[in-house]
């Protein structure tokens, strides 16, 4: 009598996550009588995958009718495969008895599951930073298999090199995750800049997945302040201008102080954007010179994006003969102008 053979023709089978996998198994003889069972893994810790006689295996169906007389095909189909199904599957013949005795195992079929990486998620720094500072962006993608993957970072189309990338776990696993950190040095021109994390994997049909982050979320461009006085008007009123330029984000509060006392507070809103994404804002203050006996110290105080206030001061000269000041120019009035940033 020829010895019974359990034939698993495929050494390995690859399937895409979500698909079905067919694991083939035939036996060379109907003798001896006894059931066939499918296991994942070998040894004492093996996991029962399918047993015709008993148990509930909702995702596993026999390929041919196992109750059919003289059936020698014990192939199974596993539906809706996930990376967790990866492993080596054994078709095992038992001799009928009490209990049944394991007689022979097939050589095993290794099931590998190919799974696409999730869309990369890019996160930036929790707090804004100013130009010349370095900020870190993190990119994460999960659930892919096999492990081989490439990740590249770009800023405005140029590949970044200050990058650290890890694929976990290091050993064999059903699926993998990638996490990468890119360090970017900010410039004042980066309001409209973008960083892109690009992930390429064998399962993607030639097109990398991309995650993006806008540097506008990470950058703060502090304003430049300039306080100037226009020519004195005939009615003894002086127009003083505070120009706040090249700032981002728009969140800005401007306060005028006359001799240290708050005169007016304004909030920036609905400002037109500069080409580079920054904003400009101009505020005017009319000072009635005839109402003052002494020089007036005007301060333009700007609080930008929750940062400590920045001041720029300007002294308006009050003369003993105010009427003669009508022709004075701004330059002639700069005597003791204070232009310090406090």
């Amino acid at each position: 009598e020829e010895e019974l053979q359990v034939i698993q023709p495929e050494k390995s089978v690859s399937v895409a996550a979500g698909d079905s996998a067919t694991l083939n198994c035939t036996v060379s003889s109907l003798i001896p009588v006894g059931p066939i069972q499918w296991f994942r893994g070998a040894g004492p810790g093996r996991e029962l995958i399918y047993n015709l006689k008993e148990g509930h295996f909702p995702r596993v169906t026999p390929v041919s009718d196992p109750t059919k007389r003289n059936n020698m095909d014990f192939s199974i189909r596993i539906s809706n495969i996930t990376p967790a199904d990866a492993g080596t599957y054994y078709c095992v013949k038992f001799r009928k008895g009490s209990p049944d005795v394991e007689l022979k195992s097939g050589a095993g079929t290794e099931l590998s599951v190919r799974a696409k990486p999730s869309a990369p998620v890019v996160s930036g720094p929790a707090v804004r930073a100013t130009a010349e500072h370095t900020v870190s962006f993190t990119c994460e993608s999960h659930g892919f298999s096999p492990r081989d993957i490439t990740l590249k970072w770009f800023k405005n189309g140029n590949e970044l090199s200050d990058v650290q990338t890890n694929v976990d776990p290091a050993g064999k696993s059903v699926s993998y995750s990638i996490r990468s950190t890119a360090r970017v040095v900010l410039t004042r021109r980066d309001v409209h800049s973008q960083v892109i994390c690009e992930v390429a994997h064998v399962t993607l049909q030639g097109d990398p997945l991309r995650g993006t982050a806008n540097l506008s979320e990470a950058i703060r461009v502090p304003p430049f302040l300039e306080v100037t006085q226009q020519s004195m008007r005939a009615d003894n009123q002086v127009n003083v201008t505070c120009q706040v330029t090249k700032f981002y984000p728009q969140r800005l509060q401007l306060t005028w102080l006359e001799n240290g006392n708050v005169s007016r507070t304004e909030m920036a809103s609905a400002l037109p954007e500069n080409k580079d994404g920054t904003y400009n804002w101009t505020s005017w203050l009319l000072v009635n010179v005839s109402a003052h006996r002494d020089d007036v110290k005007l301060t333009c105080q700007v609080e930008h994006d929750g940062q400590p206030a920045v001041n720029k001061s300007f002294s308006v000269k009050v003369s003993a003969h105010p009427k003669e000041q009508g022709s004075n120019t701004a330059a002639e009035n700069t005597g003791t102008n204070e232009r310090n940033i406090y």
Epitope: S12, S14, A16, S112, P146, H201, V202, T203, G206
Partner: antibody, heavy 117, light 109 residues
Framework: KVEESGGGLVQPGGSLRLSCAAS????????MGWVRQAPGKGLEWVSI???????YYASWVNGRFTISKDNSEGMVYLQMNSLRAEDTAVYYC?????????????WGQGTTVTVSS | DIVMTQSPDSLAVSLGERATINCQAG??????LAWYQQKPGQPPKLLIY???TLESGVPDRFSGSGSGTDFTLTISSLQAEDVAVYYC???????????FGGGTKLEIK
Amino acid sequence: KVEESGGGLVQPGGSLRLSCAASGFSLSSYVMGWVRQAPGKGLEWVSIISSSGSPYYASWVNGRFTISKDNSEGMVYLQMNSLRAEDTAVYYCARVGPLGVDYFNIWGQGTTVTVSS
Amino acid sequence: DIVMTQSPDSLAVSLGERATINCQAGQSINSYLAWYQQKPGQPPKLLIYYASTLESGVPDRFSGSGSGTDFTLTISSLQAEDVAVYYCQSWHYISRSYAFGGGTKLEIK
């Protein structure tokens, strides 16, 4: 299936445009490629185009060839310029596998390109 | 570019005997290796991908093994219809480029 056309005899320095008609699947879901085989020689990868239309080329192509596609028509093209005698070959259009881009599982019968004066 | 070296260039094996063809990659390609069979006047036919996965409809006398840089195609019991040229093909996941081996001509002894 895939089917190539457009091959023929061309003089050195000339141009030729090969076409590949794909049926039974959507070009927007698969990478398509061109592989060539010189007479009596082995297979040589030429180019692929991604599902979204990004082109990739073998390093020796040096800008002489351009791959493109029309998803709605189900066509893939290989524009070959500045042809040389060594470009004489059977050019196969092939589709990568459904599980990944690492293998070609559907091949056309090929179209013959002869570069000679 | 990755260079794929196939050996031997030609091979003669008796019917029913085992045939073994080797393929070596110039650098690691992990398991991204495919094997093709090409008969005269026909396009290549995919046999095996991902080093050891048998393509649907391919007889199970064909098997593949290996990873990294060294790979093997085995025909366990040669049949007359297996006479053909066999090619290995790599895909490099970093450069995203392909390369073919030079081919092995398999004949019956």
